[in-house]
Interface confidence: low
């Protein structure tokens, strides 16, 4: 599509005569008719295939034509065409005398023609005017002409359509040859693709306008290069979205279970050694002189009844001291100055001489003890029960009543309630101070994960844009299968699809 432009510059008819030689009365009121048509080797009458245009009366006899509109007409004259410019043309310019105001061909006498010129040739599209002058015996016409493309048409023959735009379908201006030149921030064949913020992650980020970086589900940060961990993740991180990878010393689905109680809480007192023994569980090994679950209790050295043969114990800063009864001596009153002849054994104890009568030993009946069988047996005085167990006298013997989670003769063994795998359906077992707890997988509940509570994750129709929803039975979550042209965990994002079809 383009325009053939004809600029009339000067017409000379000094004698003021018609083509027939007859003079105009009072002068030749001159207007022009222009016919543009396809190339003909010999220009002949016939349809003006490329268009026609007429001027109003431009002057009398000889005159110059102004460059702008004149009497409602236009100079240059415009002959628009809506086809590919062929590069060749034929042009007929007729000068006519208008006796009256009616310029229609049928209103003019046939001899009103002043002159007629016909040219033909090749003409390339361009801004430059071609100047020409045609002379007959009585008249002379000077004019120039050119072909230019209409707005939005480009190329050697005005066949390339390019309309600058800045909307959904493109962001570009047109180069002189009709090629697109993208506006800043846009790229692609039709400049439809925004250039995202520099550094925006190629897979995890996208943009709908230039210098933007919008994150796809599961990603965050200015450049969408940081994953979002699972909601509720306490002491964990992620390397891909919705993960929860636990930090050192933490366990459980959401990394909220403490596996390193010793380090995080330092429960053991008085320089005791702490050992982790399960989730929120630990054991303290006390230094000498201390007792209690956390070694928080200081032992009196006299508590172990170190003085024998009825000696009385006195605590001292640097230990203890035994006050021995008559007939005994030594650090623990262990040496006797008596013999069996002195009947030293009480409570029916029998005396046996030792060292040729220089010493003796008492053999005590049940329930009595001491060098002279002077003490009734209390088997709990030495605090034999570990881990806070309660010691009970049972006649000649004793027993330990253990706290929950411990067993053994002296409650020295830690019991794992989880050892018998009590949690059903793949539940995770956790030892607690007073028993155990099961963390059930999705789809199960109850104290031991014995109740199936599977739900249909697709029931809430979570997928958009006609995506197909599938329930993942192993996790009771949903998966969306997106139709063509959509992405996202719920198929919520439309995308410009690549030109993958053969058209």
């Amino acid at each position: 599509s383009g325009v053939f432009q004809l600029q009339l510059q000067e017409f000379i008819n000094e004698r003021g005569v018609l083509a027939s030689g007859r003079p105009c009365e009072p002068g030749c009121r001159t207007f022009f008719r222009v016919c543009l048509k396809h190339f003909q080797a010999v220009v002949s009458p016939g349809p003006c295939t490329f268009g026609t245009v007429s001027t109003p009366v431009l002057g009398t006899n000889s005159f110059a034509v102004r460059d702008d509109s004149s009497g409602g007409g236009r100079n240059p004259l415009q002959l628009p065409f809506n086809f590919t410019w062929p590069g060749t043309f034929s042009l007929i310019i007729e000068a006519w005398h208008a006796p009256g105001d009616d310029l229609r061909p049928e209103a003019l006498p046939p001899d009103a023609l002043i002159s007629k010129i016909a040219i033909q040739g090749s003409l390339a599209v361009g801004q430059n005017w071609l100047l020409d002058e045609q002379t007959s015996t009585l008249t002379r016409l000077r004019y120039s002409y050119r072909v230019i493309c209409s707005d939005n048409y480009y190329g050697d023959n005005c066949s390339r359509l390019c309309k600058k735009r800045n909307d959904h379908f493109g962001h570009y201006v047109c180069q002189p040859d009709g090629n697109l030149s993208c506006l800043p921030g846009w790229t692609g064949e039709y400049c439809q693709q925004p250039i995202c913020l520099s550094g925006c992650h190629e897979q995890n980020g996208y943009c709908s306008k230039p210098a933007e970086c919008l994150c796809r589900p599961g990603w965050q940060g200015r450049l969408c290069n940081e994953c979002i961990p699972h909601n509720g993740c306490r002491h964990g991180t992620c390397s891909t979205p919705w993960q929860c990878t636990c930090d050192e010393g933490w366990g459980g689905l959401f990394c909220d279970q403490d596996l390193n109680y010793c380090t995080h809480h330092s429960p053991c007192k008085n320089g005791a050694t702490c050992s982790n023994s399960g989730q929120r569980s630990y054991t303290c090994t006390c230094r000498p002189g201390y007792t209690g679950v956390d070694c928080e209790l200081e032992l009196s050295e006299c508590d172990s009844n170190p003085c024998r043969n009825g000696g009385s114990c006195k605590d001292q800063e640097d230990g203890y001291h035994c006050l021995c009864p008559p007939g005994y001596y030594g650090l623990h009153c262990e040496h006797s100055t008596l013999s069996c002849a002195d009947s030293p054994c009480f409570n029916g104890g029998s005396c046996r001489e030792r060292n040729q009568g220089a010493n003796y030993a008492c053999e005590c009946p049940p329930n009595f003890t001491g060098s002279n069988c002077e003490k009734k047996v209390d088997r709990c005085t030495s605090n034999p029960c570990a881990n806070g167990g309660q010691c009970l006298n049972r006649g000649p013997s004793r027993m330990c009543r253990c706290r929950p989670g411990f067993t053994g003769t002296y409650c020295e063994l830690h019991v794992s309630d989880c050892a018998r795998n009590p949690c059903a359906h793949g539940g995770t077992c956790h030892d607690l101070e007073n028993g155990l707890m099961c963390t059930c997988p999705a789809g199960f509940s109850g104290r031991r994960c014995e109740v199936r509570t599977s739900i249909d994750a697709c029931a809430s129709s979570p997928c958009f844009n006609r995506a197909t929803c599938y329930t993942d039975l192993s996790t009771d979550t949903f998966v969306c299968n997106c139709p063509y042209g959509f992405v996202g965990s719920r198929c919520e994002f439309p995308v410009g699809l690549p030109p993958s079809f053969p058209w």
Epitope: L161, H168, F169, Y190, Q192, G485, L497, P499, S500, W503
Partner: nanobody, 120 residues
């Protein structure tokens, strides 16, 4: 907002006919090519037909050539796909699409699709 809305799908017997319509809004309809593609369950999408902005250039995939005809009514901003001699393998969701330019090159916007089922 660019919108393409398909209609005319349904259940038809083998050998039967259907006429799909795609009503467009949100852009200058005369300026852009419109096409149809389909997607059967578990298969890749298949571009089956397209018509240029002027209506002068039409395209058909080999699988539908001679059976399907595409046309456009610029006054109604609508493109039609006349489907004759339908076969069971034509069963799919049919989507209307535009590349956003005058020529049939790629896809930029698509509709929600309309289901076509060919079964006896």
């Amino acid at each position: 907002e660019v919108q393409l809305v398909e209609s005319g799908g349904g259940l038809v017997q083998p050998g039967g006919s259907l006429r799909l319509s795609c009503a467009a809004s949100g852009f200058t309809f005369d300026d852009y090519a419109i096409g149809w593609f389909r997607q059967a369950p578990g298969k890749e999408p298949e571009g089956i037909s397209c018509i240029s902005s002027s209506g002068g250039i039409t395209y058909y995939a080999d699988s539908v050539k001679g059976r399907f005809t595409i046309s456009r009514d610029n006054a109604k901003s609508t493109v039609y796909l006349q489907m004759n001699s339908l076969k069971p393998e034509d069963t799919a969701v049919y989507y209307c699409a535009t590349p956003g330019i005058a020529a049939c090159r790629g896809i930029h916007y698509t509709g929600q699709g309309t289901q076509v089922t060919v079964s006896s």
